[in-house]
């Protein structure tokens, strides 16, 4: 269940998908990884407010018991949903390979 | 990929499975389920530092930039990777049903 | 596994607009990183890249051809398809599609025969 | 654009030999050439990234080297499958140019 896509707290504030531009570098891949040298990473950011995207019924009890137990229970959290592939050039033992990655790039997301 | 399991920051203070006992007013269920009338909600909670049960390529990559970008991007967050099934009693229009719910309790957990 | 398929009309008459088409399979024009490419190859002569179309839909056409060329691509079909207009004799030559992977072709189509002749 | 130049346009070799392949770029690619093996009648096969790379599945008898403008394909030990033509690709930025092609005959 896909709960409401509203966010109560303003225009962009609640869990949805953003693009960070990070280097190999960055991202730790300099010593295994050729190509890209630069990646559009897609992820999952935001706040997840009482049924905001809530992905299941897991998703509602959490936030139900995070209102009655704050300190105990956190919100849900903002992940993905589903992925986008990607490949990557990457270095072997005996040159290189196109590798494809199921479970890099975020496609959407919802609250868990 | 299930990265390393030790917690860094102290025993039970990592993602990990929790219980939480709830009854169906806490739930907000109260109106719809007959039974049970307290659930063992099983839920993970807990910190998610560097490689902690990353659950894939995107959890290695969010830490990576989360160490960089700690104001923009979040540290990876503690959810269920998967779920044990469970029944409730609940009314109908009719009288009651047993209705199994496969996404309602935590079985175990990873950083994502 | 990868595979490539090109087709075409075989022959062209100048000043007409040639059509090609790449059926692939084994891999998604919906990948981050993917690309598919054209590449000719004149009888008995060297490779010439044509133009290539990536998976977040930028193009990039060879300079001296750029004025002639359409590319696109049909992500749910798996094809992608070349035009190249006002053809002349000079662009008989077999066609080939290849996968891209960020600056690697790494599989290649069997080519296609155009001849440009009226 | 970027003019790749291989030379020698033909060579005879025999079984066993070594063969050396060069290619010149008119500027600077960094080392961001790959090579290419080509049969009669049959689509390149990809043979080399980034100068010195050797792709998925190709025998460790291709090597490349080089760097800037000048760069080197060898073949350290000829095999009878390995007579065919070769070129060279810049793929350092587009428009993607190839070299004229190496014929690499048996003597």
């Known amino acids: 269940a896909r709960n409401g896509d509203h966010c109560p707290l303003g225009p962009g504030r609640c869990c949805r998908l953003h693009t960070v531009r990070a280097s190999l570098e960055d991202l730790g891949w300099a010593d295994w990884v050729l190509s890209p040298r630069e990646v559009q990473v897609t992820m999952c950011i935001g706040a997840c407010p009482s049924q905001f995207r809530a992905a299941n019924m897991h998703a509602q009890i959490k936030t139900s018991l995070h209102r009655l137990k704050p300190d105990t229970v956190p919100a849900p959290c903002c992940v993905p949903a589903s992925y986008n592939p990607m490949v990557l050039i990457q270095k072997t033992d005996t040159g290189v390979s196109l590798q494809t990655y199921d479970d890099l790039l975020a496609k959407d997301c919802h609250c868990i | 990929a299930r990265n390393g399991d030790h917690c860094p920051l102290g025993p039970g203070r990592c993602c990990r499975l929790h219980t939480v006992r709830a009854s169906l007013e806490d739930l907000g269920w109260a109106d719809w389920v007959l039974s049970p009338r307290e659930v063992q909600v099983t839920m993970c909670i807990g910190a998610c530092p560097s490689q902690f049960r990353a659950a894939n390529m995107h959890a290695q990559i969010k830490t990576s930039l989360h160490r960089l970008k700690p104001d923009t991007v979040p540290a990876p967050c503690c959810v269920p990777a998967s779920y044990n099934p469970m029944v409730l009693i609940q009314k109908t229009d009719t009288g009651v049903s047993l209705q199994t719910y496969d996404d309602l309790l935590a079985k175990d957990c990873h950083c994502i | 596994q990868v595979q490539l398929q090109e087709s075409g009309p075989g022959l062209v008459k100048p000043s007409e607009t040639l059509s090609l088409t790449c059926t692939f399979s084994?891999?998604?024009?919906?990948?981050?990183?993917?690309?598919v490419g054209w590449i000719r190859q004149p009888p008995g002569k060297g490779l010439e890249w044509i133009a290539h179309?990536?998976?977040?839909?930028?193009?990039y056409f060879n300079t001296a051809l750029k004025s002639r060329l359409t590319i696109s691509k049909d992500t749910s079909k798996n094809q992608v398809s070349l035009k190249l207009s006002s053809v002349t004799a000079a662009d008989t030559a077999v066609y080939y599609c290849?996968?891209?992977?960020?600056?690697?072709?790494?599989?290649w189509g069997q080519g296609t025969l155009v001849t440009v002749s009226s | 654009d970027i003019v790749m130049t291989q030379s020698p346009s033909s060579l005879s070799t025999s079984v066993g030999d070594r063969v050396t392949i060069t290619c010149k770029a008119s500027?600077?690619?960094?080392?961001?050439v790959a090579w290419y093996q080509q049969k009669p009648g049959k689509s390149p096969k990809f043979l080399i990234y980034s100068s010195s790379y050797r792709y998925t599945g190709v025998p460790d008898r291709f090597s490349g080297s080089g760097s800037g403008t000048d760069f080197t394909f060898t073949i350290s030990s000829v095999q009878p499958e390995d007579f065919a033509v070769y070129y060279c690709q810049q793929h350092y930025s587009t428009p993607w140019t190839f070299g004229g092609g190496t014929k690499v005959e048996i003597k």
């Open positions: 084994g891999f998604s024009l919906s990948t981050y990183g993917i690309g």
């Open positions: 179309i990536w998976w977040n839909n930028n193009k």
């Open positions: 290849a996968r891209m992977g960020y600056d690697i072709m790494d599989y």
């Open positions: 500027q600077d690619v960094n080392t961001a």
